[in-house]
Each structure stands twice: as structure tokens, then as C-alpha cells.
Amino acid sequence: GALEVQVPEDPVVALVGTDATLCCSFSPEPGFSLAQLNLIWQLTDTKQLVHSFAEGQDQGSAYANRTALFPDLLAQGNASLRLQRVRVADEGSFTCFVSIRDFGSAAVSLQVAAPYSKPSMTLEPNKDLRPGDTVTITCSSYQGYPEAEVFWQDGQGVPLTGNVTTSQMANEQGLFDVHSILRVVLGANGTYSCLVRNPVLQQDAHSSVTITPQRSPTGAVEVQVPEDPVVALVGTDATLRCSFSPEPGFSLAQLNLIWQLTDTKQLVHSFTEGRDQGSAYANRTALFPDLLAQGNASLRLQRVRVADEGSFTCFVSIRDFGSAAVSLQVAAPYSKPSMTLEPNKDLRPGDTVTITCSSYRGYPEAEVFWQDGQGVPLTGNVTTSQMANEQGLFDVHSVLRVVLGANGTYSCLVRNPVLQQDAHGSVTITGQPMTFPPEA
């Protein structure tokens, strides 16, 4: 039978520059002598020879003279390989072949790792910062392996995922330098932290920067937005109103105006250096350039989608700074419900029927109410399901199970809670036997 060769199941993790032991063992029979042993270590994939022991002798390293066996332990069945000064290029699978009279082999994985340095943080621009300025924060960490995972968060633990660009470059030794860039609009002050994780070592390196922008002594710009959410129908254009009071002699060259998504800090639209910098939001936004000088910083959002719903912040910086957030509530009216009956013919009083009320392409989720011909609510045996399509619009299907009386009217009301729009359909079932829909 075959010789049993044992290696660790889990990869051997080795730090770059250190020595690693790839364990391999076999069970020698009584009377075993090293003269009988053939031991070969090779790279599993390329079959390149790494080290061997044959004819009673260590044949030495065939792998950059960085490998060694444990000669004093071979006779006890220890065929482990020592790999010195581990490099990134060593990562992979090594196979240990043992042959005495019988033969056996097993492969062991080497996972190379190198810890990342404590990140350094740089800020651009890094002086004369004011609230409302857009800054680029770069987090750099060096000489790690394998590629890092990078996470950003603010000073209260809120993850920052919008406007992050991370690049990782390998040097000649295969070690990675990671550079992660976060673009943010400064508030009154803020802490931004970057965490660089080595996924193999589960080693975290983190740094943070706290930015306290200068405030001018004259106080903040008062920025005004509507308190109530702006309600916009899907597919239409919406105006997110924002205004400020320009001082006498104000010129647009002094104005920094930034619209961004409140939570993710994603840039939406900006006006800086005396000109409209355009839309950073799917080219669906516009300012009112002729009105800016009068303090109208409103934003036009075209062809509103469900995904646009949320809070938008209007930052205005002249010499001073101010900001305010306005909520966009997206809505879409529900279609007039269609009613179907199952079964829909040869109906008799006492039959149980299923009435389905379907209404389409509304937002947000609908409220559905059933009632009979006398206005009595029907709440038992109602099942309502709402499914969003790719655009986020809901199709609502509400199913009522009833036992027919001599005749009856059943009506379904589908309400859009934001628009307070009601769409209703009803079905009247009369006579016996009856069919649905009634024949002309």
C-alpha cells in the first residue's frame, strides 16, 4: 500500500524576510534506514525541484540555496523543509514526495505576508482651510503583502465609502504600497480615519486626521432651505431650493457653492473660481446661473429617479461659510387597480373566490384597503405583496379571499402615502350562476 505522508491542512503563513518550516512527516517502519529513503520537495504546479534526499545523502537545495532539511530528524520520519529569507515569490504550493519501498506524497501551501506600515496622512490643500472647502485626504501605507483592505470613517464611526479611490502598486519585491484618497467637503470640523488591514495577518494599521477649519470673525453665512421635504414625481424635474444673503459688493468670483449627498458626502454639483464646475451626478443637475448673484443657490435635478431620494446638503462659502440640508422625497402615483377573479365563471353563492387587486409602478410602498359595498372594511384573509422593479418602483398585488353571498361589491383602494393619492377598483358579483367578467 501507499506510504502515508502528513502535512498541515492550513497554509503555513510566513513573514517576508523570515524563515518558514514546511512540515512533512511519514511513519518509518522498524529497521528503516536512511539509505532506503528518497525524499523530494518540489513546486506543486511547475514541478520545479526544490530540495532532495537520495542514496542516503542530502542532495542539497535546488532553490536559490535557501532550503534545508532537518537531517538529524529524518530517521524519525520528519521530512520537513526549512525555507530561509522568505520572499513574496515563494508563495504557493510545495509537494513533499517520500519513497521508501512504498511511495506517498502531500502538498503544503505557503502563504507569504508582510505587515503594512502605520499609514501617513496628507491633506491637499493643507492650509487656510475653511468650512465648505473640498479637501483631498491621502492615506498611504507601505511594504505590505498581500493587497490590503482599506476602510475610511468619520470621527463618529460612520463609514465613508463615497469619493474614495484606492490604488495598490507592487514594488520589485512584490510588496504593495497602498494609497487611498478620500475627497470631502469640510464641515465646521471633522476627524477622518483610515484603516489599512492585512487580510492574512488580520493586522490593522490606522491613522486619523482632525481638521479644524478657520472661521472668519464675522460669523457664518446663513443658508436657507425648505424645512419640509421636496416631493418630486419620478421622471419629472425637481428644484432643491437653497438661498443665502449676499453682502453689498458681492461677486461670483468669491463664491464657493457645493451640493453634495449629506450622508455619503458624494459631490453632486459645484460652482467655484467664478464658474459652474458642472454636474458630478450623472449629468442630471444644474444651477440657476442667472440667479446666483442674487443669492439663489438652488439645484435643479432632472429626470428624478427613486435612487435620488435622500438628503442633499448645500454648502455656501464666501468669506464665511454656511450649510443646510434639504430632503428629497421621491414619489410615483399608482395605476388604477385591475381586478381579477379566480374562479371567474359558474360562480354560486357559498363559493370561495380569490379577488386580486393589482396596481403598478408606484412609490413609495402603497397602503391597501379593502371594503364591501356598504363600506365595511375587509381585513381578514387579505394578503398583500409589493415588489420593486429595477427602477425601484413598486407593483402591488393584494389578494382577498371571500365566500360569495347572493351578490356583493368588493372594492380595493391603493393609497400612495406621500402623494395621498388614492386609486381604486371594484368588482360587483351578482346573480347565480354568474360569470366574470359579465358577458356583454
Epitope: 483592505e149 476602510f151 470613517q153 470621527g155 463618529q156 464611526g157 460612520v158 463609514p159 465609502t161 464641515g187 476627524t191 480615519s193 484603516l195 488591514r197 487580510p199 488580520q202 490593522d204 490606522h206 486619523s208 449629506t262 450622508d263 455619503t264 438628503s311 440640508a325
Partner: antibody, heavy 121, light 106 residues
Framework: EVQLVQSGAEVKKPGSSVKVSCKAS????????IHWVRQAPGQGLEWMGY????????DYAQKFQGRVTLTADKSTSTAYMELSSLRSEDTAVYYC??????????????WGQGTTVTVSS | DIQLTQSPSFLSASVGDRVTITCRAS?????MNWYQQKPGKSPKPWIY???NLASGVPSRFSVSVSGTEHTLTISSLQPEDFATYYC?????????FGQGTKLEIK
């Protein structure tokens, strides 16, 4: 002692709204975000959203967008959660919780005692 | 969204047993937190920042990580450990919890 004390149980009709309060004490209210988490009977924990009491920034789970409104009153150190268009599936215990810690590691270190909201016709 | 899947959902064990609860994330998370909840009570912080025990949590609790799999181990179950445990992440929006693992007395 750091504490979050929530308002009492509520029974509501379908289609109506409920507003739950969460009063903070023993720490600087504006220094930490307040989150709302609900738990339906026999079910797990479900995150609804958070508010930063200082900036009043909010973020909501997609499921609750358009139905939930989180507000905070700095003068009374109180956070509020209002849920509209109630349906029977909204019957649950609603918790407020403080997200605390130090950069870059944060967790819910203090929870309110929970407010039971029952939606029934 | 990052999904957190806990396994098992239910676990019956005896006092003195060694038990493990796994929380698998659908993608990498910056850190994982764990909470303990007993019936009729609010959740309590149990383990934060992947492997740090919250105040008052006994040292028989530990967490190990392999890739996106976080494993909570109780080395020797005590009567007060029977509860439901939830994992939680907020590396990216939305914040998510695992569905919970209920640890019951066998």
C-alpha cells in the same frame, strides 16, 4: 451613569404614525450618533437608521426610506423616531442605541430599555 | 449591502461544553461586533472591534477570524451564557446584523 431612557409602550391603528423618544443622560449628547434598531416578536435585530445629533445628518435603511424620520433636540438631549403608515408588520420593540468607541473601532455600548409598539386594528 | 450569516441559528449545549458560533460576511468588514441578548431584555455589548471583550465579559469568550468568517468560541459554557448572540458590522452602509444564534440548554 450613561443612560438612554425611552418613552412608553404604544398601541396604534394601521395607517397611523408613532413617535418614540429616547432621552440621553450622563454624556455629551452631540458627541455620538444615535441609532434605532427594532425587533419583531421572536425575530432578530433590524437596523432602521441613525442620526448625528450635532450635524443632524441622518441615514436610513432602504426598507424604511420615506416612512421613518429621525430627529434630535440638543436642548433636551432627546432623540426621536417617527414611523408613519404603520402596518401590522411594524409591531415590534424599538430600541435606541449609542454608537460609541474610539477611532477606528465603534460599537453599540448603551441601549435604551426598548419601546413596544403594537399595530392592530 | 454586506450580509452577515450566522450559523447555526439554534444551538443546544450543556454546561461545560465548548461551543462555536460563526458569522460569515458577504465581503470584507473593517471590524465585527457581537451582542448578547436575553429574553425580554435589551441587547448588551459583548465583543467589539472583532476580538475585544466588553466590560464584564468573562475570558472564556474569544473570537478568531479567517478571511470573512468570524468565529465566537465559548471555551466552557456556564448557565449565564445561554442567550441569543448577534454579530454586527458597519464597514459600509447599511449597518447590518446577523440573524442571531440562540444558545439553549440541552
Amino acid at each position: 451613569e450613561v443612560q438612554l431612557v425611552q418613552s412608553g409602550a404604544e398601541v396604534k391603528k394601521p395607517g397611523s404614525s408613532v413617535k418614540v423618544s429616547c432621552k440621553a443622560s450622563g454624556y455629551s449628547f452631540t458627541s455620538y450618533t444615535i441609532h434605532w434598531v427594532r425587533q419583531a416578536p421572536g425575530q432578530g435585530l433590524e437596523w432602521m437608521g441613525y442620526i448625528n445629533p450635532n450635524s443632524r445628518n441622518t441615514d436610513y435603511a432602504q426598507k424604511f426610506q420615506g416612512r421613518v424620520t429621525l430627529t434630535a433636540d440638543k436642548s433636551t438631549s432627546t432623540a426621536y423616531m417617527e414611523l408613519s403608515s404603520l402596518r401590522s408588520e411594524d409591531t415590534a420593540v424599538y430600541y435606541c442605541a449609542r454608537y460609541s468607541g474610539s477611532t477606528p473601532y465603534w460599537y453599540f455600548d448603551v441601549w435604551g430599555q426598548g419601546t413596544t409598539v403594537t399595530v392592530s386594528s | 449591502d454586506i450580509q452577515l450569516t450566522q450559523s447555526p441559528s439554534f444551538l443546544s449545549a450543556s454546561v461545560g461544553d465548548r461551543v462555536t458560533i460563526t458569522c460569515r460576511a458577504s465581503s470584507s468588514v473593517s471590524y465585527m461586533n457581537w451582542y448578547q441578548q436575553k429574553p425580554g431584555k435589551s441587547p448588551k455589548p459583548w465583543i467589539y472591534a472583532t476580538s475585544n471583550l466588553a466590560s464584564g465579559v468573562p475570558s472564556r469568550f474569544s473570537v478568531s477570524v479567517s478571511g470573512t468568517e468570524h468565529t465566537l468560541t465559548i471555551s466552557s459554557l456556564q448557565p449565564e451564557d445561554f442567550a441569543t448572540y448577534y454579530c454586527q458590522q458597519w464597514s459600509s452602509n447599511p449597518l447590518t446584523f446577523g440573524q442571531g444564534t440562540k444558545l439553549e440548554i440541552k
